[in-house]
């Protein structure tokens, strides 16, 4: 398992599949905010969840997301995208049985209720970026990242690696 702080540990056998091991290798409960410190919040509306990007009032409680980490083996000859080796993937769940999904057709990020095993649309390559930020790249669509557009989460195509650090795809994870 990853060394983790105050979160349940997993010590599962890992296998050399695309995502190695069916169970996550660690989990981390964190609040998610943008580079500009706006909070990502989740609201139940008409029996479905909506995702918002908003400024919280002082002392307003932040919503938490459970990040489940998976180890992924990514051989370049299979993927054809010039990316190889080991990488970390995550799924994000703000509430039981609901996970963030990439809707590549609509370029949107949605909350879907589903059972395990989760579909590929629920997995994101986790990028460790500068300024204590992370980015989430769609497993199903390399080069497409979760980003902020018009106070909502959306899928944003990053045209080149030089644009990987544009602020609208940078997020902060915090235990508080």
């Amino acid at each position: 398992a990853f060394g983790i702080s105050g979160v349940q540990k997993y010590t599962r056998a890992l296998h050399d599949s695309s995502i190695t091991g069916i169970s996550p290798i660690t989990e981390y409960l964190a609040s998610l905010s943008t580079y500009n410190d706006q909070s990502i919040t989740f609201a139940l509306e008409d029996e479905s969840y909506e995702i918002y990007v908003e400024d919280l009032k002082k002392d307003e409680k932040k919503d938490k997301v459970l990040l489940s980490y998976y180890e992924s083996q990514h051989p370049s000859n299979e993927s054809g995208d010039g990316v190889d080796g080991k990488m970390l993937m995550v799924t994000l769940s703000p509430t039981k049985d609901f996970w963030l999904h990439a809707n590549n057709k609509e370029h949107s990020v949605e909350l879907h209720k589903c059972e395990k095993p989760l579909p590929d649309q629920a997995f994101f390559v986790l990028h460790n970026m500068h300024s204590n930020c992370v980015s989430f790249e769609c497993k199903t669509d390399p080069g497409v990242f979760i980003g902020v557009k018009d106070n909502h989460l959306a899928l944003i195509k990053v045209d080149s690696s030089e644009n990987l650090c544009t602020e609208n795809i940078l997020f902060k994870l915090s235990e508080t």
Epitope: G3, S76, D81, V83, E162
Partner: antibody, heavy 121, light 111 residues
Framework: EVQLVESGGGLVQPGGSLRLSCAAS????????MNWVRQAPGKGLEWVAE??????????DYAESVKGRFTISRDNAKNSVYLQMNSLRAEDTAVYYC????????????WGQGTLVTVSS | DIQMTQSPSSLSASVGDRVTITCRAS??????????MNWFQQKPGKAPKLLIY???NQGSGVPSRFSGSGSGTDFTLTISSLQPEDFATYYC?????????FGQGTKVEIK
Amino acid sequence: EVQLVESGGGLVQPGGSLRLSCAASGFTFNKFWMNWVRQAPGKGLEWVAEIRLNAINYVKDYAESVKGRFTISRDNAKNSVYLQMNSLRAEDTAVYYCIRRNYGNWFFEIWGQGTLVTVSS
Amino acid sequence: DIQMTQSPSSLSASVGDRVTITCRASESVDRYGISFMNWFQQKPGKAPKLLIYAASNQGSGVPSRFSGSGSGTDFTLTISSLQPEDFATYYCQHSKEVPYTFGQGTKVEIK
């Protein structure tokens, strides 16, 4: 096959300059952060410099021991990363390794074979 | 800067022995629920090779006898049954933030 090949090492006098090159192959070079690490003869490993991606330019970081003297750069068109070393000192004598971080930038994954730099009069 | 203190600096062991190397960071190397702690193996005249990343995950092609554990500041590399090809120098390293520092190394020699 993923490969990093360093070149440019050699003997140089104190105060002199040297430019190390690292040629990358077998992967999409511009998707990865690159580093240099050195190892003095019979000693341990010391991180030297990193070049990572940024929206406007490249973010570069250096060890205190080389700051102001060494410059890291990259040419994505040539799949290469460089280390320009100026005002060289005897204590810069080491094998210099070029390193690629993993995709997602969590750890040092691929190392080159190294190139020896000797600073001596 | 985060300092890495590795121990022992050297050890003698026999083939089949269980070997444990420890590394202590001067402050936590955890972030995002992950420990930014890595272990490398280096043989004479060769480049270091990644063994373990994120405290406990094996690098590509690393035999299962190598395992890592720990979080926060205290970490361990274990070789469950030492093989002839394992005699080498082992380094811990954190990759949380610059400067990325290494431990001073542990040389594993044949008894």
